[in-house]
Each structure stands twice: as C-alpha cells, then as structure tokens.
Interface confidence: medium
C-alpha cells in the first residue's frame, strides 16, 4: 500500500469562452480508495479556489460554469490525490479561456453541383458557424477547412476558406460520388470536429477544368477574377 | 516592488563547497517556484536548479545534479544553493529567479547575480 | 534535451528599423493540454540580469513597450522589435520551459550601426 501516484491535467476545452472543462488522469491509486481533489487560483491572486462542479464533465474532470469563467483571467490549477497513505500532487497547468475554445463543428452543410449554361460546372458547398459561438460580438473569428473525397478514395483533398461560410471548387471527376465535411476553429483554440459528412453525387457530363479558370463576379462575389489550380487547391497539411 | 538580492559568492579552490543565499520581497514568496540561472563570464544563460511552491519538487541541470540542493526557507523569504564539489567550469555569476507562477513557467525578476569563482 | 537555436548570432539594425530574431527547438514546446507554446524572450544589457519581455511565445509582460511582439508555435519562434530604439541594443534569449532541463538559445547580440 502507497500513496497515490501523481495526476496529470492532461484536457481543457471550452465550447464557446463562456464556460469550460478540464480533464485529469489519475496516477497510480496505491491500492487505496484515492480522493482527487481540484484546486486553483486566478493570476494575480493567491487565495485558492475548489472546483466547482466535478459533474458535468463527467469522471475526473472538473466543469466550470458561467459564473466561474473569465476571459480576461487566466486559471492556475492542479489536481490533488489523497489515500490514506499521503497525497501527491499534479503539475500546475495555467489555463486561458481565449486559448482553449474548440467549437462544435459547423451546422447545416449544403452541398449543390453548379453549371451554368456559359461556364464551367462547379461545387457550391455552404454552411453555418455552430450555434453556441456568438460571431455578432466580434470575441471570434472562426476559420473554415473543408474536406472531401470520391468515396472510395483513401486520401482527402483539403481546402482552406478563411473566414468564408460557402466555398466553390472545380476540378472534380466526373461520375463520382463525394463525401464532404466542414470544421471550425476560432483564432486562438483548436478545430471543431468534422461535421457529418455530406455526399454528392457528380455528374458524368461535369467536365474537368484546364489549367485557369474564369470565374465571374456572381460566383466570387466581387471583382472578376483570374484563379489558378494554386489557388483553387490551397492545400494544408496537418 | 520585486527585489532579489543574492549572496555568498567568492573565490573557493576546485572540490570546495559554497552556500548561495536570495534575500526576497516585495512579493508573496511561499506563492511562487524559484530558480537559479548561472551566466559564465562572456557566455550565455544557462539554467541550474528550481524548486516548486511545495519544497519537496526541485530539478537540477544534470551538469549540477547530485553535486548542487536548491532548498527555500519560506518564513524568511529566502532562497539557498548548496554547492559541493565545485568545478572549474562552475565559475559564473549566479542569479536568484522569481518564476511568474508557482511552478517553474518563464522567470519575471532576476537578482542582480553573484559571482562564484572556481580556481586554485 | 530540447535545444534552442537562435539566429542570427548577431544583428546590427539602423535606428527606426524592424528587426527579428528567430528561435527554433528541437522539438514542439506546443502543449495539446492548454494551447500554449511554452516559451520566453529575455533582454540583456550588458551589466545587468536578464529582463523578461515575452511568455507563452506571444504575451508581453507588463510594463515592456508594445514595439516588442511575439510570435510563433510548435519549434520556430520570433522576436520582432517593430522600430528599433537606441535602448534596444542589448543580448536576446529565447528559453523553453515546457521540460526540465529548461534551456535557453545561445544569444543574439543587437546592435545599432
């Protein structure tokens, strides 16, 4: 029989920057009923603070709710284990709310084949941001990758849209049947999951592209443009 | 206002032993892991030990380890380096370092150093 | 150990000027529990102790001029001083403390030409 062995904090997610949730792993127990305790204290201050909801976040973790939550603090916190032999302690993990959000993925993702009469046919993908992140305040800014693939590939082709909630893409095989996703992340924090895939069938007669294309003002929304294959696959590896 | 005030520096020959002292305050000492930096003359930073909040986490440089005990006295705000065996290449000034938390996560005030010289 | 590479070793700026010095580790100081980048920019002149200037890669510390950023994840990093001042000239130290040993870049000497 032994004292615990030492926990480590090891997950801090926040959904939206108005709550948020840390999780630990317990150490070894020592072969003794171990009690996990969560304490912590706000940058600037040194009065220490018990967690205030071990529930919601389910087993070994600690939920912070709105009343608890600060954006403009930043969180210093450990995890204590106690068996009846002694206690050990986590290392401290500091916590900045700005920094731990991982939205729920993008809502409602629609995807249309295009052609126009006069033009090349294209993929009209378009979605919303998750309902729990208020963009009308300006805290966030969330960014979009979009992923697809013919459904028996192995590789996806990812895209990246910025700050767009509708992306265009051209270069696609004809006849195939595509699954295609979307996910989020604000400036600061982590990607959402990919939202449930969407499919699409393409038709036959949906031709590839040359090497540029032209597409028009009503499709880019603005200026009439140029776009190359550089720009319509702006690939990024993770 | 922050002050760290190193002492027990001098001249010792190769194999000798040495206790640093950092006076502290202006702050909550017994709040915050402290460190020792060492700094040979001409060259770089090079980090030593540190000891957490609770005295019982130190960390040693393993050019130090098993020769060099952090140790705190926090009813006196004070911070202690034991150094035994010391080497030729131990020669440096010493700095006391605050860390902004209570474990050792980037070091907000330094003292202003003492010189350790190791020579016969 | 991780290892910090600074360059360059030394940089001798004009008055006004932007300036950046790089840091590399030798593997990623980029926590998955908290999203920070585990690491400090110090100034030194010469006579004096090191003075923080930026943690967590990005977040200066208080009382340090805004002409000061930081920048960077993962093992590349940069100082940039966005129009250096004469009182700039001084030693800069990149430092990791995401492992023991923490350990600092060699240095890069600023100068004013």
């Known amino acids: 029989q032994l004292p615990p062995g030492k926990p480590e904090i090891f997950k801090c997610r926040s959904p939206n920057k108005e709550t948020f949730t840390c999780w630990w792993r317990p150490g070894t127990d020592g072969g003794l009923p171990t009690n996990y305790s969560l304490t912590y204290h706000r940058e600037g201050e040194t009065l220490m603070h018990e967690c205030p909801d071990y529930i919601t976040g389910g087993p070994n973790s600690c939920h912070f709710g709105k009343q608890y939550t600060s954006m403009w603090r930043t969180y210093i916190m450990m995890v204590n284990a106690t068996n009846q032999m002694g206690s050990s302690f986590s290392d401290e993990l500091y916590v900045d709310v700005t920094y731990i959000v991982q939205p729920d993925p993008p809502l409602e993702l629609a995807v249309e084949v295009k052609q126009p009469e006069d033009r090349k046919p294209y993929l009209w993908i378009k979605w919303s941001p998750p309902t729990l992140i208020d963009l009308k305040t300006g805290w966030f800014t969330l960014l979009y990758e979009i992923r697809l693939k013919p459904e028996k590939a192995a590789e996806w082709e990812i895209h990246f849209a910025g700050q767009q909630t509708e992306f265009k893409i051209l270069s696609l095989h004809p006849g195939q049947k595509y699954l295609v996703q979307v996910r989020c992340k604000p400036d600061h924090g982590y990607w959402s999951a990919w939202s449930p895939a969407t499919f699409i069938q393409i038709p036959s007669d949906f031709t590839m592209n040359d090497e540029q294309k032209l597409i028009s003002e009503e499709d880019l929304g603005g200026e009439q443009k140029l776009i190359s294959e550089e720009d319509l696959h702006h690939h990024h590896h993770h | 206002e922050v002050q760290l005030l190193e002492s027990g520096g001098g001249l010792v020959q190769p194999g000798g032993t040495l206790r640093l002292s950092c006076a502290a305050s202006?702050?909550?000492?017994?709040?915050?892991?402290m460190s020792w930096v060492r700094q040979a003359p001409g060259k770089g930073l090079e980090w030593v030990s540190s000891?957490?909040?609770?005295?019982?986490?130190?960390y040693y440089a393993d050019s130090v380890k098993g020769r060099f005990t952090i140790s705190r006295d926090n009813s006196k705000n004070t911070l202690f380096l034991l150094m035994n065996s010391l080497r030729a290449e131990d020669t440096a000034a010493y700095y006391c370092a605050k860390a902004r938390y209570s474990s050792n996560w980037g070091f907000d005030f330094w003292g202003q150093g003492t010189l350790v010289t190791v020579s016969s | 150990d991780i290892v910090m590479t600074q360059s360059p070793d030394s940089l001798t700026v004009s008055l006004g000027a932007r300036t950046t010095i790089n840091c590399q580790s030798s593997q990623t100081i980029l926590h998955s529990s908290n999203n920070h980048n585990y690491l400090a920019w110090y100034q030194q002149k010469p006579g004096l102790p090191p003075k923080l200037l930026i943690y967590w890669s990005s977040t200066r510390e208080s009382g340090v001029p805004d002409r000061f950023s930081g920048s960077g994840s993962g093992t590349d990093f940069t100082l940039t001083i966005s129009s250096l001042q004469a009182e700039d000239v001084a030693i800069y130290y990149c430092?990791?403390?995401?492992?023991?040993?923490?350990?600092f870049g060699q240095g890069t000497k600023l100068e004013i030409n």
């Open positions: 000891i957490n909040v609770r005295a019982g986490d130190t």
């Open positions: 430092q990791q403390y995401s492992n023991t040993p923490y350990t």
């Open positions: 202006g702050f909550t000492f017994s709040a915050y892991a």
